[in-house]
């Protein structure tokens, strides 16, 4: 017969014939022969290949470094990549997660629109009319002002998107 | 064309290590397998395991304790370990390439006894 | 481990006989891929094994014509067509598609 020129899905060719490709999680150790199929062996500890492959070497787990703020959130296993995110307070720099950096902080006269993850920032937004903050933080939001009104008080100084609006008694009428 | 040539020592004592080694031509050690294969007198053949081209091994589960296959490619040797020795490792031992397999060694005689 | 026996273990034949050896796993040798690697070597006295089929059926070049190899799954069967007197010898089925490679114990062919 005619060497095959393609090979079915998971196989490959080589020296005109089509040799099985390894299954995730091994690595290839000899082609196949006409004697022998493709012989495959387990990728060791803290290595993986993720597809049906004819890789001679495994690829080593990603390392999350403590150093760099990073912990392990996923195991790897003979199949899989470790899967590395931030330490409380952090988040990745990137989507390949290889550092970490400390989550912003919203200013005064913002306030956080989405509490920061392991993987994304915060995002701030600008205290519009009738609200404030007037502390830095990465989880406040804006605030509502004080409302004097129900308070039976009445405004004695206007709010700012930094300040609370201050109230005060309303003044009585002499007779 | 494909050679293969096993040595060693044919008396090996009891509880001692038996080091034979097998030196190849016509393939190259880099880019094959290397397969040990006995046969005790009178007897059938037994895998003894196999060094892949990049160094990795397997081994019969029935040896692996006491067995090691090493090799050094840039003398086209293959070398095969077998520890503590007793009456029922006295074979012929063989080894043969990878995907060569109509080509065998033309196997070494070792015996154990004191 | 993957079990071969043969049998018979020894038989008598005279020159033109028909021989049929058989071979059985202890279980599927047929690869993922389709492939069953099921060999078949010939030994004589003093003398490393020869390969006369591999792959169930392939005759290895420079067999002759009188030796065929069949079978699938666990079953497989070596036949002598007729028998030569050059074909007295032991011979031996070996799997290669589950590590560890084992054989059979050997079906020695001697002379009536």
């Known amino acids: 017969p005619e060497p095959p020129t393609a090979c079915r899905e998971k196989q490959y060719l080589i020296n005109s014939q089509c040799c099985s490709l390894c299954q995730p999680g091994q690595k290839l150790v000899s082609d196949c022969t006409e004697f022998t199929e493709t012989e495959c062996l387990p990728c060791g500890e803290s290595e993986f290949l993720d597809t049906w492959n004819r890789e001679t070497h495994c690829h080593q787990h990603k390392y999350c470094d403590p150093n760099l703020g990073l912990r392990v959130q996923q195991k790897g296993t003979s199949e899989t990549d470790t899967i590395c995110t931030c330490e409380e307070g952090w988040h990745c720099t990137s989507e390949a997660c290889e550092s970490c950096v400390l989550h912003r902080s919203c200013s005064p006269g913002f306030g956080v629109k989405q509490i920061a993850t392991g993987v994304s920032d915060t995002i701030c937004e600008p205290c519009p009319v009738g609200f404030f903050s007037n502390v830095s933080s990465a989880f406040e939001k804006c605030h509502p002002w004080t409302s004097c009104e129900t308070k039976d008080l009445v405004v004695q100084q206007a709010g700012t998107n930094k300040t609370d609006v201050v109230c005060g008694p309303q003044d009585r009428l002499r007779a | 064309q494909v050679q293969l040539q096993e040595s060693g020592p044919g008396l090996v004592k009891p509880s001692e290590t038996l080091s034979l080694t097998c030196t190849v031509s016509?393939?190259?050690?880099?880019?094959?397998?290397v397969h040990w294969i006995r046969q005790p007198p009178g007897k059938g053949l037994e895998w003894i395991g196999v060094?892949?081209?990049?160094?990795?091994?397997n081994y019969n589960p029935s040896l692996k304790s006491r067995v090691t296959i090493s090799k050094d490619n840039s003398k086209n040797q293959v070398f095969l370990k077998l520890s503590s020795v007793t009456a029922a490792d006295t074979a012929v031992y063989y080894c043969?390439?990878?995907?060569?397999?109509?080509?065998w060694g033309q196997g070494t005689l070792v015996t154990v006894s004191s | 481990d993957i079990q071969m026996t043969q049998s018979p273990s020894s038989l008598s034949a005279s020159v033109g006989d028909r021989v049929t050896i058989t071979c059985r796993s202890s279980?599927?040798?047929?690869?993922?891929?389709?492939?069953?690697?099921l060999q078949w070597y010939q030994q004589k006295p003093g003398k490393a094994p020869g390969l006369l089929i591999y792959?169930?059926?392939n005759r290895f070049s420079g067999v002759p014509s009188r030796f065929s190899g069949s079978g699938s799954g666990t079953d497989f069967t070596l036949t002598i067509s007729s028998l030569q007197p050059e074909d007295f010898a032991t011979y031996y089925c070996?799997?290669?598609?589950?590590?560890?490679?084992?054989f059979g114990q050997g079906t020695k062919v001697e002379i009536k």
């Open positions: 043969l390439g990878h995907g060569h397999f109509d080509v």
């Open positions: 016509g393939f190259s050690l880099p880019t094959s397998g």
């Open positions: 060094i892949w081209a990049g160094g990795d091994t």
């Open positions: 279980q599927s040798l047929v690869h993922s891929s389709g492939n069953t690697y």
């Open positions: 792959k169930v059926s």
């Open positions: 070996s799997q290669t598609t589950h590590v560890p490679w084992t």
